[in-house]
């Protein structure tokens, strides 16, 4: 799976979309999870409604919401009031039994609010050496991660 980058501004909302084959994933609930370390487990943040027919209902866990257009095949995750600690690697998943298929790997980057003049040192996004120039931009706030780019901030 390629990783798609979604950039959002601190304090604002970020919408992440995960397209999928609606027929292949028919009847399956979906989830949004956060990758804990490069080889670690993906910790569930929020999942769609327990009754698949009602998957379009927005489900919240704290400041994160999920909703699923099961006919159109698009899972949408909203991160409200984006904070620096929200930056990191996530997955959109399709659930079946105790198994989960990855629909999309997502790297969330949190950019400093240009109107906020406080120190932006605690905001993380890939370093300057990791060029964005050739990235495939899906829409204004997302791009595919380039080969060789590191999806995790370096650990000290």
């Amino acid at each position: 799976h390629n990783t798609t980058v979604f950039q959002g501004v601190a304090g604002q909302s970020l919408q992440v979309s995960c397209p999928y084959d609606s027929m292949k994933h028919w009847g399956r609930r979906k989830a949004w999870c956060r990758q804990l370390g490069e080889k670690g487990p993906c910790q569930r943040v929020v999942s769609t409604h327990n009754l698949w027919l009602l998957s379009f209902l927005r489900r919240w866990n704290g400041s994160t919401a999920i909703t699923d257009d099961t006919l159109g095949g698009t899972l949408t995750i909203t991160l409200r009031n984006l904070q620096p600690h929200d930056a990191g690697l996530y997955q959109c998943q399709s659930l079946h039994g105790s198994e989960a298929d990855t629909l999309r790997k997502v790297l969330v980057e949190v950019l400093a609010d240009p109107l906020d003049h406080r120190d932006a040192g605690d905001l993380w996004f890939p370093g300057e050496s990791e060029s964005f120039e050739d990235a495939h931009v899906e829409h204004s706030i997302s791009r595919s991660l380039l080969e060789g780019e590191i999806p995790f901030p370096p650990t000290s």
């Epitope: 409604h49 009754l51 027919l53 379009f56 209902l57 489900r59 919240w60």
Partner: antibody, heavy 118, light 107 residues
Framework: QVQLVQSGAEVKKPGSSVKVSCKAS????????ISWVRQAPGQGLEWMGV????????NYAQKFQGRVTITADESTSTAYMELSSLRSEDTAVYYC???????????WGQGTMVTVSS | EIVLTQSPATLSLSPGERATLSCRAS??????LAWFQQKPGQAPRLLIY???NRATGIPARFSGSGSGTDFTLTISSLEPEDFAVYYC?????????FGGGTKVEIK
Amino acid sequence: QVQLVQSGAEVKKPGSSVKVSCKASGGTFAQYAISWVRQAPGQGLEWMGVIIPDSGTANYAQKFQGRVTITADESTSTAYMELSSLRSEDTAVYYCARTQENTIFDIWGQGTMVTVSS
Amino acid sequence: EIVLTQSPATLSLSPGERATLSCRASQSVSSYLAWFQQKPGQAPRLLIYDASNRATGIPARFSGSGSGTDFTLTISSLEPEDFAVYYCQQDYEWPITFGGGTKVEIK
């Protein structure tokens, strides 16, 4: 502002059918669920079924299976609930309710009184 | 089906007092629980969804708590317009079910 307006009160004979309408104004009709809930005089609330107009998919409470049909007409933003083989125990106020965003019964219609009497 | 049992059936309180209403599910419904208020001759009104989230326009005196099988609706200080019947409802599993209701009446 989404509103649900239901059809007027009905008096029916046992064994006949009734069809109650629920017209939505405001918001996107097709995307959301419309449920039907009934309330017998002095009693609690009882869920009958739900339809997703977008797909036409419906789910009914076992108790009403075979007797109730919920349909939706996207062109008029109207949902319908038809209950057949009426009996006196079906005398109740019938409510339609729709989802807005977070839960299944966000917005309710004003209710339609259906009286079944010989 | 999941049975929701509300208690007490009737709660007699005075304006300004705190009301605590209980809803117990026959099996876990996670947080898929809502609370509604109904006044005579009116349609129910959504108060709380997902066990603890207040619906739009609902005063802060209404709060919901609980998960799994035990849920509580609390009205911190009863206003005259709060005297009504309250229902809990689950949509964790088909069929969707409601509790039998708790009537909050003026003492």
